[in-house]
């Protein structure tokens, strides 16, 4: 015999109070799929976290963090606090980058400029707190006449690597 | 020869989804930062998302946060990109594009901008 | 409405010397680099300008680029009727988390 609840669609749970019928999910409650014996209550977004989507009967709200906040983890379970580009948060708030690293981020780390030398490619732009170097063309790929061409191999990602 | 092929643009309709596909090759796909770009029909380029190689983190402008999801298969050499909950702002020729910059020769490819374009694959959100 | 504003149309004639800007701010073009992109009709845009002022291999140097503060500029010299396309700007931008296009401006070749 097939279970009556397998009926019961998201957005409703089978009441095992009332003859398993389907029965709304309760106000700030939520089933994202059929079937369900119970209904998962809603996420709350308070404090440092803002609502970005609303929950509904078939899904649960979701957040994000106010401005001037982050967010960290899967669903954004934790905001942190953002920095300025060319710092870094440190135990005793946003610090700025030390000579010869960067961070292109409102987030993370500072990290060490690109080390040029080590693809045999000469320094193009060099490094701020806020950018990485620009390494140029090796000397090989320099053609007469070009005032440069794009590094074979050039850096990393949209002006900054993803921490 | 950097080559970019993109697949799975169609008609849909608004609520619907549709996922695409970018198939690289002529370079070494798992070194370099990937992104999806869009252009409503006579309008502006609009940056999606972007993902890197390492860690596979990502980030999605605004305007898709929620309903997009950019992902890569390093080993099929292939970028994607979920597109859930469309609208129909969301028509648009959509680009896959290769970033400069090999990693982990050096560590932000954003001064080296977009270097590889595929030739775009036509989405149509209308009902 | 971009983040980064550029001219919506540009004109010159042949051989004429032509400059597009692109204004932003702090978060964006005055502390990352600017890259050019070069869109012909009916075709996927190409890399015309990197790091500010760099060319990539295959630009002509009639292509160049400079930036001051939180403005970039595009210059073409020596305008040819194949120069007839739609120039964008870019950046990253740190308080975004995200790169940014200008929305194009259109150069017509008289």
């Known amino acids: 015999l097939q279970d009556p609840c397998s009926n019961c669609p998201a957005g409703t749970f089978c009441d095992n109070n009332r003859n398993q019928i389907c029965s709304p999910c309760p106000p700030n409650s939520f089933s994202s799929a059929g079937g369900q014996r119970t209904c998962d209550i809603c996420r709350q977004c308070k404090g440092v976290f803002r609502t970005r989507k609303e929950c509904s009967s078939t899904s649960n709200a979701e957040c994000d963090c106010t401005p001037g906040f982050h967010c960290l983890g899967a669903g954004c379970s934790m905001c942190e606090q953002d920095c300025k580009q060319g710092q870094e948060l440190t135990k005793k708030g946003c610090k700025d980058c030390c000579f010869g690293t960067f961070n292109d981020q409102k987030r993370g780390i500072c990290r060490p400029w690109t080390n040029c030398s080590l693809d045999g490619k000469s320094v193009l732009v060099n490094g701020t707190k806020e950018r990485d170097v620009v390494c140029g063309p090796s000397p090989a790929d320099l053609s007469p006449g070009a005032s440069s061409v794009t590094p074979p191999a050039p850096a990393r990602e949209p002006g900054h690597s993803p921490q | 020869e950097v080559q970019l092929l993109e697949s799975g643009g169609g008609l849909v309709q608004p609520g619907g989804s549709l996922r695409l596909s970018c198939a690289a090759s002529g370079f070494t796909f798992s070194g370099y930062d990937m992104s999806w770009v869009r252009q409503a029909p006579g309008k502006c380029l609009e940056w999606v998302s972007v993902i890197y190689p390492d860690d596979g983190n990502t980030y999605y402008a605004d305007s898709v946060k929620g309903r997009f999801t950019i992902s890569r298969d390093n080993s099929k050499n292939t970028l994607y990109l979920q597109m859930n909950s469309l609208r129909a702002e969301d028509t648009a020729v959509y680009y896959c594009?290769?970033?400069?910059?090999?990693?982990?020769?050096?560590?932000?490819?954003?001064?080296?901008?977009?270097?590889?374009w595929g030739q775009g694959t036509l989405v149509t959100v209308s009902s | 409405q971009s983040v980064l504003t550029q001219p919506p149309s540009a004109s010159g004639t042949p051989g004429r010397r032509v400059t597009i800007s692109c204004s932003g701010s702090s978060s964006n073009i005055g502390n990352n680099y600017v890259t050019w992109y070069q869109q012909l009709p009916g075709t996927a845009p190409k890399l015309l300008i990197y790091a500010d002022s760099h060319r990539p291999s295959g630009v002509p140097d009639r292509f160049s680029g400079s930036k001051s503060g939180t403005s970039a500029s595009l210059a073409i010299s020596g305008l040819r009727s194949e120069d007839e396309a739609d120039y964008y700007c870019?950046?990253?931008?740190?308080?975004?988390?995200?790169?940014?296009f200008g929305c194009g401006t259109k150069l017509t070749v008289l």
């Open positions: 870019a950046t990253w931008d740190y308080s975004l988390s995200g790169y940014v």
């Open positions: 594009a290769k970033h400069g910059g090999q990693k982990p020769t050096t560590k932000s490819s954003s001064a080296y901008g977009m270097d590889g």
